[in-house]
Amino acid sequence: VSRWHQQSQRSQWGGRGTTDRFPEIILERCVEYTQTLLPEMRHVDCQNIWDAFKGAFISKHPCKITEEDYQPLLKLGNQTVPCNKTLLWSRTKHLAHQYTEIQRDVFTLEDTLLGYLADDLTWCGEFETSEINYRSCPDWRKDCSSNPVSVFWKTVSRRFAESACGVVHVMLNGSCSNIFDKKSTFGSVEVHNLQPEKVHTLEAWVMHDGRGDSRDLCQDPSIKELELIISKRNITFSCKNIYRPDKFLQCAKTPEDSSCISKI
């Protein structure tokens, strides 16, 4: 605790500081999302969103942030994703976002308002001052896990999984040694917060890294482990090999092609 106190005084943490223009970026993204990207959320007051966001971490010790701190923001940014349209991902962020860029009715967490606001940003404050720390922020490994960014993603990931319904898809990276990683946000948070009374199936898409690879990666031991976890929660599990991620890239370039519209 004394180490945290000293570090907070000199504000020298092991991670990079708050993203430049952080307040402006949040407001700009909020306006873009609510007015252009998803006009059905135009009722959202972006100034209120920023105030709630700010309130979650400003003047608070950046290693003592709780999920409770983000509840006012979650309440303001509450959003319903239609059943069968939730796409989770683990180590496939770029591919998952390319997919939802084309398949506009499908949502990753970063396609929801709160995820969109915070995507790729860093932020933290300083204990007992109203300043935003642009010099450094706590690193999850080097400093502490209860930092503003980590707690935010854990909180919104939990909520995103809890609100999912119908068939939920997850895009996994077949090139990784552990295709399903229990330590990832998907493995540690989302999997355990899918609601069996609302979600009847989790379908994993295992992305191969190119044509010519004919292995059945759905047989991977880590996938079998995922199947066991999901089945124990009374959710049906299924898994599909996706051999053609190259098609993502083609479709990202020409999304108007009818070959880029597929049902899931």
Partner: antibody
Amino acid sequence: QVQLVESGGGLVQPGGSLRLSCAASGFTFSSYAMNWVRQAPGKGLEWVSGISSWGSSTYYADSVKGRFTISRDNSKNTLYLQMNSLRAEDTAVYYCAREDGSYMTDYFAYWGQGTLVTVSS
Amino acid sequence: DIELTQPPSVSVAPGQTARISCSGDNIGHYYVSWYQQKPGQAPVLVIYSDSNRPSGIPERFSGSNSGNTATLTISGTQAEDEADYYCQSYNGTYVFGGGTKLTVLG
């Protein structure tokens, strides 16, 4: 509407060559991967070869690798299959098929009527 | 490569349900499509991505896929459904089943 019309089939002796063409219309040809699928008389379907939308990647069944060459001319909306060192077992109706299915799955939504290739002495 | 096995023939009375199986090792791990082919004609896609019907295909055609078997189901089979049916999947290369001749009796 989508149309695929094959031509170039015929009778050829073993060891001979033949070039099949497939004229495409009714869609943006350069946006789609294309394939050749064949069907021997009274038999099932067999995938032969495929080519990416811009022609940069080509794929072949083991049975034709090194003998057949797939190519395309997007300016002419035409797909080709150059068949060399033909064998009796290459006798079949050859279909040109458009590869559909986006990023998650692969299938053939549109087929031509086929052109018959007979390899016999 | 995955091998897809279909029964050579299936018979069904008009109005009854026809089920055509396509078996393969863990075929449920792959998306399966189905084609209908009538004599002298090109194949026609009737099901893609396990269970999706292209526009223009009657609702009586449906598909499922899990475990080691994919199934094409034709409910209320009609005389015009008499044809050869092929399942197809992809695992780095396109693979077709051997085909099933569907006979509508009577």
